[in-house]
């Protein structure tokens, strides 16, 4: 006889999952503020900085009192999925100065993209409808100079942190409603 | 660097109104929640209330509902708090602060409003 | 009366360990992040903890959050005269649909 059928698959805990991926969030979280205080301090922002390729923001206090989870989920990881496009073409494109924010930046392209797979394991788990793939999204264009790289860290890493803090917001307020 | 910069602030008589302003800079205003708060003399912190980043939405404290409203102007980078019916235990220094998520990351300095006849 | 509980005062000599509690419901506390605001004599508040433990810019690491079910402390290793000051606890409500505080706690450095 072959060896004893091995213990029944236990569905996991909905709560636990998303717990563990609070903490995930919560660690990029505090990667990114991490990194955009070393960008500040060695190349100070002079203003805001805003790049129209990235993801408009999606959440606020007032929509908090809707969310669903499917739609949370869904709607983070394609926002995660951009940024972490843009942290890439950044480490490609960004230029010279931006190689003195290495390894970091590389660090957090690595997080960010092991987040991803966090969601997306989640929402297997949670058997949420998985989105369609990704369309090809249009290149995006070098920066115009090395200080236009260094504009555009600026509002990466402060457009990823705004976006990671919501999201840990969100997440636990879900986790409450599960 | 962000600052937010309150003004406004003034003696008042009990049932009159006062509109206080913050103005932002430093940072993209459009993107954040804004809030106000506020410290009564010798007393500790109160939320008075939220307004979302696109001004859609805003939550009130029981103690302000239907006498104060927030509002924004993201042209001007400037956040708003219309006080009316004011009342002696409205008394306090009044300030703004972003959210990124569920907490006040930077405050501005503070405007004084006192309610008194 | 506030909805969020910290001792009034708390005090300790410079190079000790000061722990602040904070303790509210499952409303508050139980469901949300946990915030800390530092308030030095005359200034503005400022950000000292969010997300329970986690650290702003800037903040240096001998502040350190922690949470437990509906309670939650700040601790301070290493104190100095420089942070002699009021410390506020915070937190969304679910049930009131605002943020609470706790009424604060002085700190003083002997």
């Known amino acids: 006889p072959g060896p004893p059928p091995g213990p029944p698959r236990v569905s996991p805990d909905p709560r636990a999952e998303l717990d563990s991926t609070v903490l995930l969030t919560r660690s990029l979280l505090a990667d990114t503020r991490q990194l955009a205080a070393q960008l500040r301090d060695k190349f100070p922002a002079d203003g805001d900085h805003n790049l129209d390729s990235l993801p408009t923001l999606a959440m606020s206090a007032g929509a908090l009192g809707a969310l669903q989870l499917p739609g949370v989920l869904t709607r983070l990881r394609a926002d995660l999925l951009s940024y972490l496009r843009h942290v890439q073409w950044l480490r490609r494109a960004g230029g010279s100065s931006l190689k003195t924010l290495e390894p970091e930046l590389g660090t957090l392209q690595a997080r960010l993209d092991r987040l991803l797979r966090r969601l997306q394991l989640l929402m297997s788990r949670l058997a949420l409808p998985q989105p369609p793939p990704d369309p090809p999204a249009p290149p995006l264009a070098p920066p115009s100079s090395a200080w236009g790289g260094i504009r555009a860290a600026h509002a990466i890493l402060g457009g990823l942190h705004l976006t990671l803090d919501w999201a840990v917001r969100g997440l636990l307020l879900l986790k409450t409603r599960l | 660097e962000v600052q937010l910069l309150e003004s406004g602030g003034g003696l008042v008589q009990p049932g009159g109104s006062l509109r206080l302003s913050c103005a932002a800079s430093?940072?993209?205003?459009?993107?954040?929640?804004m809030n106000w708060l506020r410290q009564a003399p010798g007393k500790g912190l109160e939320w008075v209330g939220v307004?979302?980043?696109?001004?859609?939405?805003?939550f009130y404290a029981d103690f302000v509902k239907g006498r104060f409203t927030i509002s924004r102007d993201n042209s001007k980078n400037t956040l708003y708090l219309q006080m009316n019916s004011l009342r002696a235990e409205d008394t306090a220094v009044y300030y703004c602060?972003?959210?990124?998520?569920?907490?006040?990351?930077?405050w501005g300095q503070g405007t004084l409003v006192t309610v008194s006849s | 009366q506030s909805v969020l509980t910290q001792p009034p005062s708390a005090s300790g000599t410079p190079g000790q360990r000061v722990t602040i509690s904070c303790s509210g419901s499952?409303?508050?506390?139980?469901?949300?992040?946990v915030n800390w605001y530092q308030q030095l004599p005359g200034t503005a508040p400022k950000l000292l903890i969010y997300?329970?433990?986690l650290l702003p810019s800037g903040v240096p690491d001998r502040f350190s959050g922690s949470k437990s079910g509906t309670s939650a402390s700040l601790a301070i290793s290493g104190l100095r005269s420089e942070d002699e000051a009021d410390y506020y606890c915070?937190?969304?409500?679910?049930?009131?649909?605002?943020?609470?505080f706790g009424g604060g706690t002085k700190l003083t450095v002997l």
């Open positions: 499952s409303s508050n506390i139980g469901n949300n992040a």
């Open positions: 307004i979302s980043y696109d001004g859609s939405n805003k």
């Open positions: 997300y329970d433990d």
């Open positions: 602060a972003r959210t990124p998520g569920s907490h006040f990351d930077y």
């Open positions: 430093g940072f993209t205003f459009s993107h954040y929640d």
């Open positions: 915070a937190a969304w409500d679910d049930s009131l649909n605002g943020v609470v």
